[in-house]
C-alpha cells in the first residue's frame, strides 16, 4: 500500500477569502487617499487631470446589479496592474519634485503589488479561469516637463483612488451573493 493519504484538503471559505481581499483593498484605498491629499497640499491641482494611458472606469451604480465575481476580479486585476505600472513609471520618470512623495509612493507600490498577488491567489482558490498572461505594454513616454509629471501624478492617484473605491463596494456586494 502506498503512503497514507494526507490530511483532507479544506476548501477555502469564499466569503472569508473575499473578506481579506476587501480589507486589503480598503487599506490601499486609505493609503491612496492620504497620498493624494499630500500631493494636493504640495502641488495644488488646477482643475482635472487625465492620462490617456490609464484604464477607463469599470464600475458605476448601474453596473452593480450585473456584477459577477470572475468578471470583477479579472477586470480589477487588469486595472490595478495598469496602475502599478503607472506608479512605477511615476517613481522612475516623475522628476525631482515627486521625490518629495517618497517613501510613501514606494509603500503604495508595494501594497498595490501585494493586493494584486492577493487577487491572483483568490482567483486560483476559487478556481476561476486564470486570465492569459498580460501582453507587453508599450512603454510610457516620460513627462514633457516637471509640471507634466505632477499632473500625471494627480491623474494616477485620483484614478487609482476611484478604482479602489468602487472595488471595495463591488467586492462587498459580491460577498453577499456568495
Amino acid at each position: 500500500p502506498g503512503p497514507p493519504p494526507g490530511p483532507p484538503r479544506v476548501s477555502p471559505d469564499p466569503r472569508a477569502e473575499l473578506d481579506s481581499t476587501v480589507l486589503l483593498t480598503r487599506s490601499l484605498l486609505a493609503d491612496t487617499r492620504q497620498l493624494a491629499a499630500q500631493l494636493r497640499d504640495k502641488f495644488p491641482a488646477d482643475g482635472d487631470h487625465n492620462l490617456d494611458s490609464l484604464p477607463t472606469l469599470a464600475m458605476s451604480a448601474g453596473a452593480l446589479g450585473a456584477l459577477q465575481l470572475p468578471g470583477v476580479l479579472t477586470r480589477l486585476r487588469a486595472d490595478l496592474l495598469s496602475y502599478l505600472r503607472h506608479v512605477q513609471w511615476l517613481r522612475r520618470a516623475g522628476g525631482s519634485s515627486l521625490k518629495t512623495l517618497e517613501p510613501e509612493l514606494g509603500t503604495l507600490q508595494a501594497r498595490l503589488d501585494r493586493l494584486l498577488r492577493r487577487l491572483q491567489l483568490l482567483m486560483s482558490r476559487l478556481a476561476l479561469p486564470q486570465p492569459p498572461p498580460d501582453p507587453p505594454a508599450p512603454p510610457l513616454a516620460p513627462p514633457s516637463s516637471a509640471w507634466g509629471g505632477i499632473r500625471a501624478a494627480h491623474a494616477i492617484l485620483g484614478g487609482l483612488h476611484l478604482t479602489l473605491d468602487w472595488a471595495v463596494r463591488g467586492l462587498l456586494l459580491l460577498k453577499t451573493r456568495l
Epitope: 480598503r26 484605498l29 491641482a45 482643475g47 482635472d48 487631470h49 487625465n50 472606469l57 458605476s60 451604480a61 448601474g62 453596473a63 485620483g158 484614478g159 483612488h161 476611484l162 473605491d165 468602487w166 471595495v168 463596494r169 462587498l172 456586494l173 453577499t176
Partner: antibody
Amino acid sequence: EVQLLESGGGLVQPGGSLRLSCAASGFTFSHYDMNWLRQAPGKGLEWVGVISYDGSNKFYADSVKGRFTISRDNSKNTLYLQMNSLRAEDTAVYYCARTPGSHFDYWGQGTLVTVSS
Amino acid sequence: QSVLTQPPSASGTPGQRVTISCSGSSSNIGNNAVNWYQQLPGTAPKLLIYYDDLLPSGVPDRFSGSKSGTSASLAISGLRSEDEADYYCSAWDDSLNGVVFGGGTKLTVL
C-alpha cells in the same frame, strides 16, 4: 478644488415643474456617478436618485419615481434634475453630490425649492 | 419614519467622548458599507466616515466609526464646541435599491 453649485430653485405651484442644475468643477465630471438629495425644512436627509458616470443608468427613490428625471451633460460638466407634478411635500433644499463608490464625498451648497399655492 | 434608526439627540461636555448609534437590517447595514455625515447649522452635509471606519482627508482622528452586524456607531473623542451639529448615518439598501439615511442625531456640546 472640487466645487458643485446648484441653481434653479424657487417658488412653484403644486402640479408645476422646475429644472435644477448643478455645475461641477475641479474634477473629471465624466468619471463620477452623481446624485440628488434633499432636506425638507427642519427634517433629515433624503436621497432622491443617482445617475451613472456616462448617463446610461439611473435609480430613483420611490417617493419621486415617475415624476423626477435626472440627466447630465458631460460636455458641460452639468447635472440636472427635472421635477414634474410637484407636491407640497417636495418642498426642500436640494443638493447635488458626487459618488466615488458608496458615499457622497462632495456636496453642493443646496438650492431651495418651495411648492406652494 | 427613517429606515435607519438613530437617537434624536446626544450631548456631552468639552473633552468628553460621545457615541451615536445607528441600527438597520441585513438589507442595508448588514450587507453594505455605512457612511456618516456631519451637518453644521446652516450648511451642507459633509462626509465624516466612509466604508464603516475610514476617514476622509481633513477629518480629525477624534472621529471614528465601527460596525457590527446590523448596527453601526460613530464615536467622537475629545469633544469640542465646534462638533455641535447634526450627524446622519447612511447605507445602500438592497431591498429598496437606493440609499437610506438615519433620522439624524442632534449633538449638543454643553
